[in-house]
């Protein structure tokens, strides 16, 4: 018969014959022959191959470098790479998550509307009238002004978006 010019899925063409690809998690040791099947070997510890392949070397698992703020989100297997994510309070600088930066803090006068995730930064919002934030924080929302009336006190100093109201005693009526 004529030698094949194309092979089926999960096969590759070599020396005019179709050989089986190695399955994910295994690397190629030797091509098939007329008499022998393709020889494959499992990837070693901390190695992987994630496709049907004819690679002679497995890929190294990604290293999640703690000096770059990274930690392991999902441990790699022989078929999958390690997935890194950022330490609490940090987020990735790129889609590949090769390093991390601190989440944006909301300045005094602003509160956190949405806490940051691994792929998006903190969303800040200006504190509306009746609310304040006196700290720079990536977690704190705007706080409501103290209600002096509920404490039988009066407002001695108005609040701002950065400061709480100051309450004081009511003036006693003179007899």
């Amino acid at each position: 018969p004529e030698p094949p010019t194309a092979c089926r899925e999960k096969q590759y063409l070599i020396n005019s014959q179709c050989c089986s690809l190695c399955q994910p998690g295994q690397k190629l040791v030797s091509d098939c022959t007329e008499f022998t099947e393709t020889e494959c070997l499992p990837c070693g510890e901390s190695e992987f191959l994630d496709t049907w392949n004819r690679e002679t070397h497995c890929h190294q698992h990604k290293y999640c470098d703690p000096n770059l703020g990274l930690r392991v989100q999902q441990k790699g297997t022989s078929e999958t790479d390690t997935i890194c994510t950022c330490e609490e309070g940090w987020h990735c600088t790129s889609e590949a998550c090769e390093s991390c930066v601190l989440h944006r803090s909301c300045s005094p006068g602003f509160g956190v509307k949405q806490i940051a995730t691994g792929v998006s930064d903190t969303i800040c919002e200006p504190c509306p009238v009746g609310f304040f934030s006196n700290v720079s924080s990536a977690f704190e929302k705007c706080h409501p002004w103290t209600s002096c009336e509920t404490k039988d006190l009066v407002v001695q100093q108005a609040g701002t978006n950065k400061t709480d109201v100051v309450c004081g005693p009511q003036d006693r009526l003179r007899a």
């Epitope: 987020h91 790129s94 909301c106 006068g109 949405q114 792929v119 998006s120 930064d121 969303i123 800040c124």
Partner: antibody, heavy 121, light 107 residues
């Protein structure tokens, strides 16, 4: 290369509804927050709505809150804007916008060509 | 909401001129500012982000500076293709807001 293609614009009467779509390609759609930004004829830019990368949170400009709904289908790489109770002041070109993401979140790095919505009786 | 005010509203300059556009925020926005260019009938294009970082593919004649409330976009040597509208945008806090725009015309 990144491509954002909007569709669904047109002429609609006040009080009626319209749904805009945006087909995204050339980037990992499911990793990025997306926005809608609009521009009334001869006017400036106005941010309209945001949806997070996984659709878990959504934010709206006060001018459209309660009337517009942003959504996404990551399996189809598509962003949507459902616009109900349309008003004359919603007349604008609507742009589908990719968030720059990660350490550059809330900057808008790629924009679609825009789709015109005209609200008129 | 944070108001963004641009000046001038329009500028007419010759090829080779240095053009400066300013943007003022109503509150401190640190360095969370972007500049966009929009040509007639086209979508805006990101030029500068984080106040001074040049977006990939943007010519180096564009530069940004400033922090806090006052920001500047500079075109060091105006080219014929630089005409259009320029907008600043604050990315410090929700809701994200734009300046009203500056129209750049070539003399």
């Amino acid at each position: 290369q990144v491509q954002l293609v909007e569709s669904g614009g047109g002429v609609v009467q006040p009080g009626r509804s319209l749904r805009l779509s945006c087909a995204a390609s050339g980037f990992t759609f499911s990793n990025y927050a997306m926005h809608w930004v609009r521009q009334a004829p001869g006017k400036g830019l106005e941010w309209v709505a945001l949806i997070s990368f996984d659709g878990s949170y959504k934010y709206y400009a006060d001018s459209v809150k309660g009337r517009f709904t942003i959504s996404r289908d990551n399996s189809k790489n598509t962003l949507y804007l459902q616009m109900n109770s349309l008003r004359a002041e919603d007349t604008a070109v609507y742009y589908c916008v990719k968030d720059a993401g990660y350490s550059s979140s809330w900057f808008f790095d790629y924009w679609g060509q825009g789709t015109l919505v005209t609200v008129s009786s | 909401d944070i108001q963004m005010t641009q000046s001038p509203s329009s500028v007419s300059a010759s090829v080779g001129d240095r053009v400066t556009i300013t943007c003022r925020a109503s509150q401190d926005i640190s360095s969370w500012l972007a500049w966009y260019q929009q040509k007639p009938g086209k979508a805006p294009k990101l030029l500068i982000y984080a106040a001074s970082s040049l977006q990939s593919g943007v010519p180096s004649r564009f530069s940004g500076s400033g922090s806090g409330t006052d920001f500047t976009l500079t075109i060091s040597s105006l080219q014929p293709e630089d005409f259009g509208n320029y907008y600043c945008q604050q990315a410090n806090s929700f809701p994200w807001t734009f300046g009203q725009g500056t129209k750049v015309e070539i003399k």
